[in-house]
Structures are given as C-alpha cells and as structure tokens.
Interface confidence: low
C-alpha cells in the first residue's frame, strides 16, 4: 500500500505574487520543479514514491502539498524530522528560507487539498 | 581561520586502493559540504562527489561510482576519500575543499581548498 | 551533465588591459533568480581560489578589478586591468546540477 502525508510550510524569502496561482506560469512552474528536486534530495530512502497536489499560497510563499511512501517505511514523525534537517540544506542549495512546518496524515491523498 | 589540511602524498600501484584524508579547523565542521575535486596533470577540474559530515549523505559523480567512498568522523573533523581499483588515469592532484557561507548566510560556494593531495599511480 | 564551455582557451594581454573570459553553460543555471556559478583562479602548484560566487558577487579580499556578470547560460568574468599577477587559470563551475562541471579553464598571459 501507500502513505500520503500533507506538508504545508513557509518560503519566507520568497514574494507571493499571481504568477503562482497560474500551474502555466514560468514562475509556477521553476518553483515547483525546484521543490520536486529538493523532495527527491531529502526522501532519498527507497520508500518515497513521489509528491503532487503542490499549491501555493499567499504569506509570502506558502507551500503546501502531498507526499507518497511505500507503506510502513515512514510516519509522520520522521517525514517532519527529516525535512526540518533538511532546512539549512535547503537554504544553500536552494535559496529557500523555510519556516513554519507542518505535517499530517492523509487518510485519502486529495481529500485535504479541496 | 578557516583550514583543510589533507595527507601527504601517495604512490599506488594499479589496482590498488587509495585512502586520502582531510582535517577541517576552523568552523562548525557538521553543516558543511565537503567536495572532492581532482586535476590530473596538466589538466582541468572535476567534481568527484561530496559528503555532509553531520548526516553522512553523499552524492558521487556517477563516473567515480562504485569506485569511490566518501567518509566523515566527526570526532576528529576529519573527512576521508577512498578511491578503489586505481589505474594509471587516476594519477592527479585530489582536492578536498568546504562548500561554505559568507558571513552573512547568503551565498554559498565552494571557498576553502586544502593543499591537494598528489597520487601517482604507477606499476 | 550541464556542460561548461569556456573561451578563449588562451588570452595574452599587456598589463593594463581588459581582459574578458565567457563561461557558457549547456542548459540554465539560475534558481529562483540566483546564478549557481562561480569563478575560480588558479596558480600553478596552488589550489583554486575563489574570486565570484552566484556569478557576480565579490569574495571577500578579492581585488575589485574583478567582476562577473551573466545569467542563465551565459557569464562573464571580467579584468578591468590586467596585473602581473593575474596570470593564470580560471575556471567556472556550476553548482545548480550534480554532478557539478568545471569549464576547461581560461589561461590568462601576458604579452
């Protein structure tokens, strides 16, 4: 089976602009290639499937978005220690200020973004 | 003062295995990247790889994989570059250096180099 | 890879004079408006020393005659008037892919 959990967190040095609730966007759609690649570099473990559904927000940048796990290899825990390990990693690979992290279960994966 | 002081040099002969080390001082030594570069004579640079000293995590160039081992004991702040199955084209300089930040934590680069670690490989 | 290439291979110049290196990368380097380039100098039997990092920005201790420019593909290291001492090699470097690429390095000469 799979594991879907919801990761919302803040891009702090980055400006929320319109640009971001358009997926057709050059800006869109760096910034969500450049957040795929980070997820791919801190879930390297064999049991991260992927991620989708990433939106943005207002509140400088607000990113929220769901990720995948091969069932058992991950908890909700461990999703969260692992990217707040990752926060000073990504600030110098990636530019991004990141703060205010939050992560749940998702008991069906799309259900929390509506 | 930031400083990375690497081994001395080294004389192998093909098919044998090299380890190099490299003693950072200086700085908090954990956060930090350390890269691998390599020169061979007379010629240009190329990245070899990284290790974060504080979790481990390592990315290789894909044409030293399965060849080469990044290690960090963070005892002694020293970081270690194991190059296995050595052949003749192997004979370069290896260079650790730290990918730091400026003062202020807003740009990052490589900026400290050792002194390079010369290793001839030769039957 | 991102593949850099950088020209002339060789430039001989009096002191005084302009000199300008180019670094061309095969696919873009910029994230989120940052450059992931960096400049290098490198004397022979020294290790490289870092002059620009995220494509233009100074290190410290570096001269000013030293400046870089570009963005995305293209770069420039430029010496607005050639010292003795910066004869050399320079290299730029990318850091936005792994595995990170060097161009092959510009030897700078002089006349």
């Known amino acids: 089976g799979v594991s879907f959990f919801f990761l919302s967190f803040h891009i702090s040095n980055l400006q929320f602009n319109s640009s971001l609730e358009d997926p057709s966007t050059d800006y869109y759609q760096e910034l969500q290639r450049d957040i795929s690649e980070m997820f791919l570099q801190i879930y390297k473990q064999g049991g991260f499937l992927g991620l989708s559904n990433i939106k943005f927000r207002p509140g400088s940048v607000v990113v929220q978005l769901t990720l995948a796990f091969r069932e058992g290899t991950i908890n909700v825990h461990d999703v969260e220690t692992q990217f707040n390990q990752y926060k000073t990693e990504a600030a110098s690979r990636y530019n991004l200020t990141i703060s205010d992290v939050s992560v749940s279960d998702v008991p069906f994966p799309f259900s929390a973004q509506s | 003062e930031v400083q990375l002081v690497q081994s001395g040099a080294e004389v192998k002969k093909p098919g044998a295995s090299v380890k190099v080390s490299c003693k950072a001082s200086?700085?908090?030594?954990?956060?930090?990247?350390i890269e691998w570069v390599r020169q061979a004579p007379g010629q240009g640079l190329e990245w070899m790889g990284e290790?974060?000293?504080?979790?481990?995590?390592?990315n290789y160039n894909e044409k030293f994989k399965g060849r080469v081992t990044f290690t960090a004991d963070t005892s002694t702040n020293t970081v270690y570059m194991e190059l296995s199955s050595l052949r003749s084209e192997d004979t370069a300089v290896y260079y650790c250096a730290r990918y730091g930040d400026d003062t202020s934590g807003g740009y990052y680069a490589v900026d400290y180099w050792g002194q390079g670690t010369t290793v001839t490989v030769s039957s | 890879d991102i593949v850099m290439t950088q020209s002339p291979a060789t430039l001989s110049l009096s002191p005084g004079e302009r000199a300008t290196l180019s670094c061309r990368a095969s696919e873009s380097v910029n994230i989120l408006g940052t450059n992931l380039i960096h400049w290098y100098q490198q004397k022979p039997g020294q290790a490289p020393k870092l002059l620009i990092y995220h494509a233009s920005n100074l290190e410290t201790g570096i001269p000013a005659r030293f400046s870089g420019s570009g963005s995305r593909t293209d770069f420039t290291l430029t010496i607005s008037s050639l010292e003795p001492e910066d004869v050399a090699v320079y290299y730029c470097?990318?850091?936005?892919?792994?595995?990170?690429?060097f161009g092959g390095g510009t030897k700078v000469e002089i006349k």
């Open positions: 470097l990318q850091s936005r892919k792994i595995p990170w690429t």
């Open positions: 200086g700085y908090r030594f954990i956060p930090y990247w």
């Open positions: 290790i974060l000293p504080g979790t481990g995590r390592t």
